[in-house]
């Protein structure tokens, strides 16, 4: 466990021509806060999630009038840091959005107004316990500079947050196998030591003495295997022998969600859907009317002229909730072909293909016959999704690279005898049968079943397969 | 650009039937996946069933053995029989496909929706 901080250090126009207009003026004085979303990962796969690692609201900034025919200056800011606790592990690379949000303070019917100044985002490689890392981002005309950290909370250290330390024992060195704990070198590395008779297979333990089950098992000690046949309570029901999942406390008891808001589970978390005229991370920002802009991915708003009557966003397509800020799943449809891994960007599907498959939807098949050659004049068949060579008489092989041994088929009916030979095979045909492959038998009144053979070729002779 | 063209919604009695269609025209080279989703008021919006990139026939758990999805290639049409209705099934119900308007290029497109509402 710990805390990813942010600290933002100015907020303003950005250099170059075209500085922003001031966001306040002496009619209608405002003050800024800021967000923070975090989600797990470097990839494009970070896109997909709704702020997985967690997310904070800034307090509100000290209030800012535009003084008359001045630039607009860097922003008075809010005091104090930006904090998102972590339950979890670090995971090392993780996505960040920030979003600079006015609250209008004028005489306005309803109180405050909001609306989004700016939005950046960026990916980053960060370790837990480093120093602070600087960054500076642009959105439009307007630059955000700021500082961030991610710290581990006590007994956690490590890069990760996932190593535990405690005092010493002993003042001179900490036991056997068991390391300092820099940069807390007066205390040790805690062996993590899981529940006594914990299954290893189908356990882990996140603090020492714990023993908590993987998906599929329950138990004191994760040793029975769920069964939902029999299980009736909704996150199943109970009772370690008949192997029925325990309803522990999950992420939705309590209804973290404010407002009205419907709590759904998440595999992290959980995530709230929120009734109009709110939102948030738990549907905490309120009062909000369209001219607040709370349709987010170019969502159209409707109604809401004032606080009190509620607004509607008409989402674009591929998105959806009252402030059209989740994203259709798409990818439940499959689109990726051949085993493809499907990504949701949200401007765009991608298919991350298996080897020997390309394309936008891996619908290339990279073993067909387009630009394959067949050795040794063999020509390409393809069928089925795959490619096969037909090889020429004396070549075998996936690529027909191989010289075939023209006899291993056996050819030679009726016990003839097999010889291979530099343009095929020949064969040596037994006593009264005759032929290229000594299929025809020869009539007892010596006329064979063909005409009459060549001259100077008897019956019985070796035939010569061409 | 593509268009998709739904129609067939309408409202019903619990256990009735409906039969929606979803036609795509423009510049289609070829369809990648098609199908239905729906977004009932205040939920998310999921797949109701459709065809996959790989040409199988998907459905949602909620509706196996009561809808029925196919699709017509020639005129670049899918369907949805929907019987014994719930009330559960109320929703919009968006055609959606996944389209090659040439060789190397798909994009996903989305219909405008036909509303189905079943009540008694």
């Known amino acids: 466990a710990g805390v990813f901080e942010l600290q933002i250090h100015s907020f303003g126009p950005g250099p170059g021509p075209g500085a922003p207009r001031s966001p306040c003026s002496a009619r209608l004085p405002c003050r800024l806060f800021f967000r923070v979303c975090l989600k797990p990962g470097l990839s494009e796969e970070a896109a997909e999630s709704p702020c997985a690692l967690g997310a904070a609201l800034s307090a509100r900034g000290p209030v800012y009038t535009e003084q008359p025919g001045a630039p607009a200056p860097d922003l008075p800011l809010p005091d104090g840091l930006l904090q998102v606790p972590f339950r979890d592990a670090w995971p090392g690379t993780f996505s960040f959005i920030i979003e600079t949000w006015r609250e209008e303070l004028g005489d306005q019917i309803g109180g405050p107004a909001w609306s989004l100044l700016a939005r950046v985002a960026g990916r980053r490689r960060l370790a837990a316990g480093g120093p602070w890392a600087r960054d500076i981002q642009r959105a439009g005309a307007w630059e955000l500079r700021f500082s961030y950290r991610a710290r581990c909370e006590p007994p956690a250290v490590g890069t990760a947050c996932t190593r535990l330390c405690r005092p010493r024992s002993a003042p001179s060195r900490c036991g056997p196998g068991l390391r300092p704990c820099a940069p807390l070198e007066d205390e040790c590395e805690a062996p993590l030591v899981c529940r006594a008779g914990c299954s290893p297979e189908h356990g882990f333990c996140e603090q020492p003495g714990e023993c908590r089950c993987l998906e599929g098992w329950t138990g004191p000690l994760c040793t029975v295997p769920v069964s939902t046949s029999s299980c009736l309570s909704p996150r199943g029901p109970s009772s370690a022998t008949t192997g029925c999942l325990v309803p522990g406390p999950g992420p939705c008891d309590g209804n973290p969600c404010a407002n009205g808001g419907s709590c759904s589970e998440t595999p992290r978390s959980f995530e709230c859907t929120c009734p109009r005229g709110f939102y948030g991370l738990r549907c905490e920002v309120s009062g909000v009317t369209c001219a607040d802009g709370p349709c987010f991915n170019g969502g159209l708003c409707v109604g809401g002229a004032d606080p009190d009557s509620a607004y509607i966003c008409h989402c674009p397509p591929g998105f959806q909730g009252s402030n059209c800020e989740k994203r259709v799943d798409r990818c439940s449809l499959q689109p990726c072909r051949n085993g493809g891994l499907c990504l949701d960007l949200g401007h765009a599907l991608r298919c991350r293909c298996r080897a020997g498959f390309a394309g936008p939807r891996c619908e290339h098949d990279l073993d067909d016959c387009a630009g394959r050659a067949c050795a040794n004049g063999g020509t390409c068949v393809e069928g089925g999704g795959a490619h096969r060579c037909s090889c020429a008489l004396g070549f075998g092989g996936r690529d027909c690279r191989e010289r075939a041994d023209p006899c291993a088929a056996r050819p030679c009916a009726h016990g003839g005898r097999c010889y291979a030979h530099f343009s095929g095979l020949v064969c040596a045909c037994a006593p009264g049968y005759m032929g290229a492959r000594c299929e025809f038998p020869v009539h007892p009144d010596g006329a064979s079943a063909l005409p009459a053979a060549p001259p100077g070729l008897r019956p019985g002779d070796p035939q010569r397969y061409l | 650009e593509v268009q998709l063209v739904e129609s067939g919604g309408g409202e019903v009695q619990p256990g009735g039937s409906l039969r929606l269609s979803c036609a795509a025209s423009?510049?289609?080279?070829?369809?990648?996946?098609m199908g239905w989703y729906r977004q009932a008021p205040g939920k998310q919006r999921e797949l109701v069933a459709g065809f996959t990139g790989d040409g199988m026939t998907k459905y949602a758990e909620s509706v196996k053995g009561r809808f029925t999805f196919s699709r017509d290639n020639a005129k670049n049409t899918v369907y949805l029989q929907m019987s014994s209705l719930r009330a559960e099934d109320t929703a919009v119900y968006y055609c959606?496909?996944?389209?090659?308007?040439?060789?190397?290029?798909?994009?996903?497109?989305w219909g405008q929706g036909t509303l189905v509402t079943v009540k008694p």
């Open positions: 959606a496909a996944d389209v090659f308007t040439d060789r190397d290029h798909v994009d996903w497109y």
């Open positions: 423009g510049s289609i080279f070829s369809i990648n996946a």
